[in-house]
């Protein structure tokens, strides 16, 4: 059967029919339905939503929809013993306590089971001591404190502002600095955009608002007790002392009203420069400890949260492919939220729901995709990407043999300015071509393409007339598919203007104020940005599942490999003497990149010319494209990060959210001038160059003619 026969309608008409079926009004309705109560992982509320989604996906027409459950380590506050932070006087009396909950937003006063703000997986403890302000608690902030300012955090409680990097990295850095507790807070400089009112009158964070979130350093492990394997009924679980990625010191988040009370008394050193000052009316002194009059006062944390093995539920829907049912294109996003999930995740889940409905409508009319499409509603993403990772661990053998692509679908919006895409270079051309066919929702771009508004508002720093597409990092459910399994992955959402809005993420992220009304009143009243994101995500899935030849361009990988090789070489060249002393050469890497470029070019020529009516040759060429991403996987993984196995990309060791290129070499070079054994350190650089060069060369050879 040809693809057209199998799928009933001409490919062009299919895509148009699919896109035309997507409706903004439906996304709005679904978002409302998904956000009326909290859906915290491991609760009955979230299980009921899983069953509802299962039922509705079946109604929409999917071939099968199953729940996949796992028993994973989660973390919750003690219901009868709340977490808080105090200022205590010399007698140990609590003279100030932080709030125990966020004031509920209007209309939600009677909602039960709103989990109070907490740092998931914090150990229990009641440390007390002097405070040190550590800015964003980034690697460079601790370098500034320890190396330049000679401030010792050992035995101190540190207070860090949210933003710039993943909170788990902040906690890891504080632990390494010897801190005995961490207080995380949202500074208005990062979470209050000028000229906008706070919720409920605008989209800014009120003083009592607090960002929840996990503080793990899992490095892709999934469930902390079952790394590498699914947390099923017969799983062998590690003891809590051997669990992966758990923090060792108590951590708690607060809002800026409470932060003001702690920071206003700070003494000790002045902030080193203006980049350490936020927007509160406090001196931003680093400490340690409080100033003169308050020097005998201390800070005490009271943390009573518990870690519990809890059952979670993924929803997995299948739309069987007509021609290549053993090739899987996956669209997945999470369902669990910290509270109402108005943006994270339900703005994404509502879009997935509408995409499923549209595909189901086509299927009911007799159409099927060429390849199988899997739809996933992941659980426990907020607790460390657990649902997606456990499912991928359970199905890894199928996925590594059959996985064509994974498209992520968390929050559809983090702003309403322009499109934001992070993906494998293999998908660049797919994204470009698709966005040229879609209408821009942006004001001032009526009748223009999405590609045009996106390129104008977010231009590529390298190529004029093209939009910026970023590297994949982590902090979301694509991680296991891309970083561990090497399945081509991508994500798209609408974002803010990063040039004018310097705050981190969106202000109400992971707070109780992330409601349906936030989206409907302030971000996307017409749901036109949601619809556009649905068209991009859905359109990508459609093309990946239905095009006769996979819409991957290996030449784009060649271009970025050269760029990344140049970048890492220039970093290394900051140490010319050592490179000479230790005979460090990048020749092998540049040679491999050159070979990759030439072989990719020849492969692309063959791709234009081959006989697409020959199913064996077609399948062979498509397999070479599918397995190219897989070829960048090193089975041994990165040093000390066995589940980050992609040699070209990994989450930054300093910020899980960010992607790093040639991460093995990058980490080997990082802060190399401070290493006690330079010979060993430069030896590791050489080894990482060798691994990268070999991997690029090996990947190139998968594109060579097979015989």
């Amino acid at each position: 059967k040809s693809s057209n026969e199998a799928t009933n309608i001409t490919p062009k008409h299919n895509m148009k029919a699919f896109l035309d079926e997507l409706k903004a009004e439906n996304i709005k309705k679904f978002l409302y339905n998904f956000t009326q109560i909290p859906h915290l992982a491991g609760t009955e509320q979230n299980f009921q939503l899983a069953k509802q989604i299962q039922s509705q996906w079946k109604e929409f027409g999917l071939d099968s929809v199953e729940l996949a459950h796992y028993d994973v380590l989660l973390s919750y506050p003690n219901k009868t013993h709340p977490n808080y932070i105090s200022i205590i006087n010399e007698d140990g009396n609590e003279i100030f306590n932080t709030s125990l909950f966020e004031p509920p937003p209007p209309g939600y006063e009677n909602v039960s089971d709103i989990v109070p703000p907490f740092s998931a997986f914090s150990p229990q403890g009641m440390p007390e001591g002097d405070l040190v302000y550590v800015n964003y608690a980034r690697t460079e902030d601790f370098f500034k404190l320890e190396r330049d300012m000679k401030i010792n955090c050992s035995g101190k409680i540190v207070i860090a502002r949210y933003g710039k990097v993943f909170r788990g990295n902040k906690v890891k850095n504080a632990q390494l600095a010897g801190a005995k507790g961490v207080i995380l807070y949202s500074d208005p400089a990062d979470y209050f955009a000028p000229g906008v009112k706070s919720y409920p009158d605008g989209w800014n964070l009120p003083g009592g608002g607090v960002q929840r979130g996990n503080i793990l350093n899992l490095n892709g492990a999934g469930d902390p007790l079952t790394p590498g394997y699914p947390a099923n009924e017969y799983a062998y679980r590690r003891g809590i002392a051997e669990a992966v990625g758990l923090p060792s010191i108590p951590v708690h988040p607060i809002g800026y009203y409470d932060a003001q009370k702690l920071l206003e008394k700070m003494g000790g050193s002045a902030p080193p420069d203006s980049s350490w000052r936020g927007s509160l009316k406090v001196p931003y002194n680093v400490g340690p400890g409080f100033t003169g009059n308050f020097s005998t006062q201390k800070v005490k944390m009271h943390i009573h949260s518990t870690n519990e093995v809890t059952r979670i539920y993924n929803v997995i829907g299948t739309l069987r492919g007509a021609v290549e049912p053993d090739r899987y294109v996956i669209l997945g996003g999470h369902r669990d939220s910290w509270v109402f999930g108005g943006i994270d995740p339900q703005s994404g889940a509502a879009v997935v729901h509408e995409i499923v409905r549209s595909f189901g409508t086509l299927k009911k009319e007799g159409w099927r995709p060429r390849r199988t499409i899997l739809f996933a509603s992941w659980d426990a993403e907020e607790f460390g990407l657990l649902g997606s990772t456990e499912w991928a661990e359970e199905n890894s053998r199928l996925l590594q043999e059959r996985g064509v692509a994974y498209i992520n679908a968390d929050s559809s919006i983090e702003g309403n300015y322009t499109l934001r895409v992070d993906c494998t270079p293999l998908m660049y051309s797919l994204v470009h071509n698709l966005t040229k066919e879609l209408k821009s929702p942006d004001e001032g771009f009526e009748g223009k393409s999405l590609y045009e508004s996106w390129t104008k508002k977010s231009p590529s720093p390298e190529f004029s007339g093209m939009p910026r597409i970023s590297k994949l990092g982590s902090g979301n459910d694509f991680e296991v598919f891309f970083q561990r399994l090497g399945i081509a992955s991508g994500r798209a959402r609408y974002t803010k203007n990063w040039e004018t809005n310097k705050f981190s993420g969106y202000p109400l992220y992971h707070s109780v104020y992330e409601t349906y009304e936030l989206v409907e009143k302030f971000y996307d009243p017409m749901f036109k940005y949601h619809l556009t994101v649905a068209q991009v995500r859905g359109g990508m899935v459609f093309e990946l599942a239905n095009s006769i030849v996979l819409p991957f361009d290996c030449r784009d990988y060649a271009v970025v490999l050269r760029k990344y090789a140049d970048k890492i070489y220039s970093i290394s060249m900051k140490h010319p003497q050592e490179m000479k002393t230790y005979s460090v050469s990048f020749d092998s890497l540049f040679s491999a990149v050159k070979n990759f470029t030439e072989i990719a070019s020849k492969f692309s020529e063959r791709l234009q010319d081959f006989d697409k009516s020959n199913p064996i040759v077609l399948r062979m060429m498509n397999d070479q494209l599918m397995f190219l991403e897989r070829a960048f996987i090193d089975p041994l993984g990165l040093p000390d990060r066995p589940f980050y196995r992609h040699v070209i990309y990994a989450p930054s060791s300093h910020n899980k959210y960010a992607g790093e290129s040639f991460p093995g070499i990058y980490d080997a070079l990082f802060d190399i001038e401070s290493k006690v054994d330079p010979s060993k350190a430069w030896g590791e650089v050489k080894r990482q160059i060798y691994v990268a060069a070999f991997t690029v060369q090996a990947a190139a050879e998968t594109l060579s003619e097979v015989a």
Epitope: E44, N46, F47, H69, Y76, N110, D113, V115, R311
Partner: antibody, heavy 121, light 107 residues
């Protein structure tokens, strides 16, 4: 269809023990716990405790602690409630009810038909 | 322990009447309250969970609401099959406690 089927009526002497069973079907047994509630003749309802078979955790009403033991058999999807040192005021209908195993739940959704326990000398 | 005070203990009403039953919690229980219906010789059946959510298959004439620690079950138009005893149940904190019950009888 979710069903909780309880064992038959029992007549016991004071000081004896009774063990009531509750066989579950129509759902994944380990995804839920079982609560036990009793109702004395003509009286209201009284919560005795609950057990979660996946974790093996039990939570007892202090009033019954030391006299009650709740257990489960995952292989047969059956929950048991044993009450010892029976007194005449333990005469009641004993119900099992399903409860979701999670941090937040909505308490008892499906109930067994009840088991009458009569304590009489 | 949290006390649940239910009123009235009994009421007589006719088919088609609007019936209201209340429960007061001795302390804050949020919205962690269910309403159960029990007919003579039968097991209780849950009608409403989390203060106001109807269980599947429960007619829409049943509704629940909350004002602080006061909870109300309303039957908008009493039907013959609604004559039964109704209990509230708080599950905010252990031990879970029930109201004393309200017997709805035919006038």
């Amino acid at each position: 269809e979710v069903q909780l089927v309880q064992s038959g009526a029992e007549v016991k002497k004071p000081g004896a023990s009774v063990k009531v069973s509750c066989k579950a079907s129509g759902y994944t047994f380990t995804s839920y716990g079982i609560s036990w509630v009793r109702q004395a003749p003509g009286q209201g309802l009284e919560w005795m405790g609950e057990i979660f078979p996946r974790r093996g955790n039990t939570y007892y009403n202090e009033k019954f602690r030391g006299r009650v033991t709740m257990t489960t058999d995952k292989s047969t999807s059956t929950a048991y409630m044993e009450l010892r040192s029976l007194r005449s005021d333990d005469t009641a209908v004993y119900y099992c009810a399903r409860v979701f195993d999670g941090y937040y739940n909505y308490a008892m959704d499906y109930w067994g038909q009840g088991t009458t326990v009569t304590v009489s000398s | 322990d949290i006390q649940m005070t239910q009123s009235p203990s009994s009421l007589s009403a006719s088919v088609g009447d609007r019936v209201t039953i209340t429960c007061r919690a001795s302390q804050d229980i949020g919205s962690s309250l269910n309403w159960l219906q029990q007919k003579p010789g039968k097991a209780p059946k849950r009608l409403i969970y989390a203060t106001s959510s109807l269980d599947s298959g429960v007619p829409s004439r049943f509704s629940g609401s909350r004002s602080g620690t006061d909870f109300t079950l309303t039957i908008s138009s009493l039907q013959p099959e609604d004559f039964a005893t109704y209990y509230c149940l708080q599950y905010a904190s252990s031990p879970y406690t029930f109201g004393g019950g309200t017997k709805v009888e035919i006038k």
